[in-house]
Every structure is written in structure tokens, then in C-alpha cells.
């Protein structure tokens, strides 16, 4: 996991790579592109990251900050019950959801929404500063 | 400028094996998502595999999984392709190409090595 | 997989003409849509990303427009360096799918 100093504050701070955004422990890639649920996963893993699992509301608010009325793909399914990608389960907020088909998880400035995973939208990706730690 | 050169092809028996080999200049290796592509008369073109910056994934379609497993040495600026239980059907012109890094396919494109795979 | 269908598979123009391929989708790719054109011994080069942005060095001619699933590439005023085959590739949903090519012959 990506724990231990904070980074914000450190004297020599892990930089993240070329188009990635930094923010406290983490690395984040905000898409310009759009790619259905599946590809924007294999999006994040070719490149060494993962797509966005959040970790408590105040990551969350954070993020939102960066996002518009548009809709990005997180990493958030529901496969018996709303989970992380990570296999964590959906705890600290609510998704709202129209339809049973709507089996993957997005984000935007107002919250998450599930959509159909077919759906080309933008996405997120996280990762860590460091090249040889693993997020999960 | 970006340049990728293929080697490595070849004529080879149903049932063998083949590597391929790609070597990448003019851009920072380590810094970009690969693939190979190939292209048939009869299927046209058709991606193959893809191996992330690092190495430690790799995304392939499934009537080439088990049988080909893409690789790479960032130290060597290079990338494989390995083949194992070759049939008639991967006879193929083979492409090195880079992935475009904001997720747009690939960008640039090898010149191609042949594999003829045929008894 | 999505289908792509490309057409017309083959065509004869002229020198000066104005040419216009089509690509369908058999479902929504938005705007993940790149045309390449390649000539005969060579590699496919990228013309055309996000269905409408030329790459550097591709000459004004060459245009691209549509969104949804149904695509359109447009050369302006055909050159003789023009005459190849041009296919389309959706990158909206793995695996990447290419269209089966469109031949562009001299008159």
C-alpha cells in the first residue's frame, strides 16, 4: 500500500510521471479519451496504475474538485453487492442507480452513479509515486 | 523520431515456436504501453497483445491466449513477442507498434516481419 | 467485439477529387475512432486520431468527422501520393477492432 511519510509536506518529495496529477500519497491520471468500464481498466494496468478506487469521502471531495458534470469510470462494480476493485465494499457513500443493468460504478462532481460498463465515458486512474510499489 | 524495427520472422513447421523481437529508439521505452498487431489477407488487421510500461501486465485477445505471451527489456529498449504451438492460421505480416499514451491505439508502427507458418 | 464495417471496400478516383469513406460501428464508440493509411510493403501510418484530430504532418486534406457509430473520412482534393488503403480502428472497447480496409485506386 501506499502509506508512510506524507508526501505534501516532506522535504524531497516522490514526483508522479508526465501527465499524472499528484495529490497527497497518490498519483492521479484524469482521461482526456473515453473507453467502456473494461478498457479503461486495462487502460490504468498498462500503465502500471490502477482504475480509481477511493478510500474514504475525503479522497472523494477531493477528487470531485477536478471533475465536471461528465461522468468518469472508477473502479467500482457491482457483483453481488457494489465493490472496489480492490475487494473492498462500497461503505462510505451512496451510488445511485436506474436500472439492474447498470453494473459499473462512475464518479462526477455531484457523486457516483452506476451505468451500463458498455458506456464509453472518460476515467481515472490511481497510483503510487514510487515505480515498485504495488497500490493493492 | 520513433522508430520501431522488427526481426525475427520467419518459416516454421505447425506445432514450432518463434520469438519475435522489436527494437524501439527515439523515445523513452520505459515510458510507453507496446503491442504487436498482425495482418492477413483474409483477416485484415488484428491486435495481438499489449504489455504495460513496466512489464508486470499484459492483455491479450482470447484466441491467442496460452499460445503467445508478449515481453519486454526497458533496459534494452526492447520487445518480444514469443509464439509456442504456431498453426496455419498466425501466418501473418507482424507489427511492433507503440501505444499512444493517452489511450488512442497506437501511434506508430514497425515496418512488420513475416511468419509463415507452414509444413 | 464491436464490428466495424468499412466502405466502400474498394474505389477509383481521379487526381483532384474529393473522396469520402465511411466506417460503422455496431455500437456506441463515441469519438475512439483513428484512421491509418497504408501503402503497399509499408506499415499503416496513424492519419486521423479521436475521429477528427490529425496527426503532425498529415496534410489539411484529410478530415475526419462523426461520433456514435457512424464515421467519415474525407480526403478534400486526392493527390497521387494519396492513392493506398485506408481502414478505421475503434480503441472505445478492448479488443481494438479495425475495419477491413478501403482500396483507393488511380481512375
Known amino acids: 500500500l501506499c502509506q508512510g511519510s506524507n508526501y505534501s509536506t516532506c522535504a524531497s518529495c516522490p514526483s508522479c510521471p508526465d501527465r499524472w496529477m499528484k495529490y497527497g500519497n497518490h498519483c492521479y491520471y484524469f482521461s482526456v479519451e473515453e473507453k467502456d468500464w473494461n478498457s479503461s481498466l486495462e487502460f490504468c494496468l498498462a500503465r502500471d496504475s490502477h482504475l480509481l478506487v477511493i478510500t474514504d469521502n475525503q479522497e472523494m471531495s477531493l477528487l470531485q474538485v477536478f471533475l465536471s458534470e461528465a461522468f468518469c469510470w472508477i473502479g467500482l462494480r457491482n457483483n453481488s453487492g457494489w465493490r472496489w476493485e480492490d475487494g473492498s465494499p462500497l461503505n462510505f457513500s451512496r451510488i445511485s442507480s436506474n436500472s439492474f443493468v447498470q453494473t459499473c460504478g462512475a464518479i462526477n462532481k455531484n457523486g457516483l452513479q452506476a451505468s451500463s460498463c458498455e458506456v464509453p465515458l472518460h476515467w481515472v486512474c490511481k497510483k503510487c509515486p514510487f515505480a515498485d510499489q504495488a497500490l493493492f | 523520431q520513433v522508430q520501431l524495427v522488427e526481426s525475427g520472422g520467419g518459416l516454421v513447421k505447425p506445432g514450432g515456436s518463434l520469438r519475435l523481437s522489436c527494437a524501439a529508439s527515439g523515445f523513452t521505452f520505459r515510458n510507453y504501453a507496446m503491442s504487436w498487431i498482425r495482418q492477413t489477407p483474409g483477416k485484415g488487421l488484428e491486435w495481438v497483445a499489449t504489455i504495460s510500461e513496466s512489464g508486470n501486465y499484459n492483455n491479450y485477445p482470447d484466441n491467442v491466449k496460452g499460445r503467445l505471451t508478449i515481453s519486454r527489456d526497458n533496459a534494452k529498449n526492447s520487445l518480444y513477442l514469443q509464439m509456442n504451438s504456431l498453426k496455419a492460421e498466425d501466418t501473418a505480416v507482424y507489427y511492433c507498434?507503440?501505444?499512444?499514451?493517452?489511450?488512442?491505439?497506437?501511434?506508430?508502427w514497425g515496418q512488420g516481419t513475416t511468419v509463415t507458418v507452414s509444413s | 467485439d464491436i464490428q466495424m464495417t468499412q466502405s466502400p471496400s474498394s474505389l477509383s478516383a481521379s487526381v483532384g477529387d474529393r473522396v469520402t469513406i465511411t466506417c460503422r460501428a455496431s455500437r456506441d464508440i463515441g469519438s475512439s475512432l483513428n484512421w491509418y493509411q497504408q501503402k503497399p510493403g509499408g506499415a499503416p501510418k496513424r492519419l486521423i486520431y479521436?475521429?477528427?484530430s490529425l496527426d503532425s504532418g498529415v496534410p489539411k486534406r484529410f478530415s475526419g468527422s462523426g461520433s456514435g457509430t457512424d464515421f467519415t473520412l474525407t480526403i478534400s482534393s486526392l493527390q497521387s501520393e494519396d492513392f493506398a488503403t485506408y481502414y478505421c480502428?475503434?480503441?472505445?472497447?478492448?479488443?481494438?477492432?479495425f475495419g477491413q480496409g478501403t482500396k483507393v485506386e488511380i481512375k
Open positions: 507498434v507503440r501505444d499512444d499514451w493517452e489511450g488512442r491505439a497506437m501511434d506508430y
Open positions: 479521436a475521429t477528427s
Open positions: 480502428l475503434q480503441y472505445a472497447s478492448s479488443p481494438w477492432t
